[in-house]
Amino acid sequence: APRGTQAEESPFVGNPGNITGARGLTGTLRCQLQVQGEPPEVHWLRDGQILELADSTQTQVPLGEDEQDDWIVVSQLRITSLQLSDTGQYQCLVFLGHQTFVSQPGYVGLEGLPYFLEEPEDRTVAANTPFNLSCQAQGPPEPVDLLWLQDAVPLATAPGHGPQRSLHVPGLNKTSSFSCEAHNAKGVTTSRTATITVLPQQPRNLHLVSRQPTELEVAWTPGLSGIYPLTHCTLQAVLSDDGMGIQAGEPDPPEEPLTSQASVPPHQLRLGSLHPHTPYHIRVACTSSQGPSSWTHWLPVETPEGVPLGPPENISATRNGSQAFVHWQEPRAPLQGTLLGYRLAYQGQDTPEVLMDIGLRQEVTLELQGDGSVSNLTVCVAAYTAAGDGPWSLPVPLEAWRPGQAQPVHQLVKEPSTPAFSWPWW
């Protein structure tokens, strides 16, 4: 650091004073010199280092009428908000000719009430779940001892005797407030008060109770909620998308979920208006007066297939001699699953019913036995999925074929000699 030489008398007639105060204090250091001729620029040192960006001003006035007379120079260094980094030894420095002069030192010290570097933050925690809170304070003067308070009640007999920087809370069953006091020789500072809100624990064991094509019954086990009873639980269901890849803990799915509320108890809910034979993901959260729990992970579920809700449409049956031509269209009503085929039944007035599995074709030619004199022959068709048969169509009487009527070429299906199985219907 530059040092004043003793060859000439120091020009400084006033040296920086001392400042000791609390953080945030605004203070001013000044030095004064008297020089002959053009006044020099006054620099400020802190702990021997020139302050390049000092908030300083310099005021100078000539004592005489001649510029070569003496000048009074006052340099002022302003400290706007005292911080720990401002503390140290301060001096003024001037270069006069080939010499360097340094004033006597002044000292800036920080001393006051403790200052918080970290304070407890508001947060939410699940009931009976451990968590930590942080508090950190410093002087000077040191040492700084902390005292934690819960709901304004000290958690130790004296400052410094209990937990210090980190408070471990094994769990809460009610919403509580926490603060910490910082004590030093100058007094006490109290931190902000953090509110720790106790929410219900995440529900567990979300599972399916029963499945139907358009509804799922689900149940779960509620988590602890402290002294606050659960008011309701909310269940969300979303259509699964193969490309979406919902996994445990992943972000919310892109579709708008179907949301249902359940009064509790019981911790069970019937989700209706679902699509049959469709994969869904479901999750549940439960709410008390303090707020909602976290959601469970998404659980993949699937509605089962159902039977078709309606019979095949536009059934026509025409007869030409010993052959009968029957065709139909797919049911307009929801299939509730994957269509596996059609069943056809026909019966004469005095003959047993014949039941056939046609597969996925929508037309068939029946080869009637005998001379074709079976009277009042009627045909019924039903669609089926893996879940079973849908409703049968109303019996359609066989009409005689009239010349000129279009007749598609059908694969002949020989009527079996004995019925494949008999079906009690209509």
Epitope: V13, G14, T28, T59, V61
Partner: nanobody
Framework: QVKLEESGGGLVQAGGSLRLSCTAS????????MGWYRQAPGKQRELVAA???????NYRDSVKGRFTISRDNAKNTVYLQMDSLKPEDTARYHC?????????WGQGTQVTVSS
């Protein structure tokens, strides 16, 4: 804009005393240097006395030991106590305030010392 107003001047016999006051319209604690200047007819203006924020006073050689400058920051006032006045002290006395590159001047008060 800071206004400086001088008072206390007058006619006094040689060897007598006067106390000049300079009151500022704003706080004077921020002014690094406060001074009293004088200007006699047909002469250059000259610094009589100055006082800094460190309460260090400077005087013109011709007034040393006779004049005393002081400042009262609480009253925003600077004083010049003039004792053992001489006829050559006759002049218009002006108050001045300096801070960095700013300076303010008063209109002055007349001091006449008769022999």
């Amino acid at each position: 804009q800071v206004k400086l107003e001088e008072s206390g001047g007058g006619l006094v016999q040689a060897g007598g005393s006067l106390r000049l006051s300079c009151t500022a319209s704003a706080s004077i604690s921020s002014f690094d240097i406060m001074g009293w200047y004088r200007q006699a007819p047909g002469k250059q203006r000259e610094l009589v006395a100055a006082i800094t924020t460190l309460d260090i006073a400077n005087y013109r050689d011709s007034v040393k030991g006779r004049f005393t400058i002081s400042r009262d920051n609480a009253k925003n006032t600077v004083y010049l106590q003039m004792d053992s006045l001489k006829p050559e002290d006759t002049a218009r006395y002006h108050c001045a305030a300096f801070q960095s590159d700013q300076n303010y001047w008063g209109q002055g008060t007349q001091v006449t010392v008769s022999s």
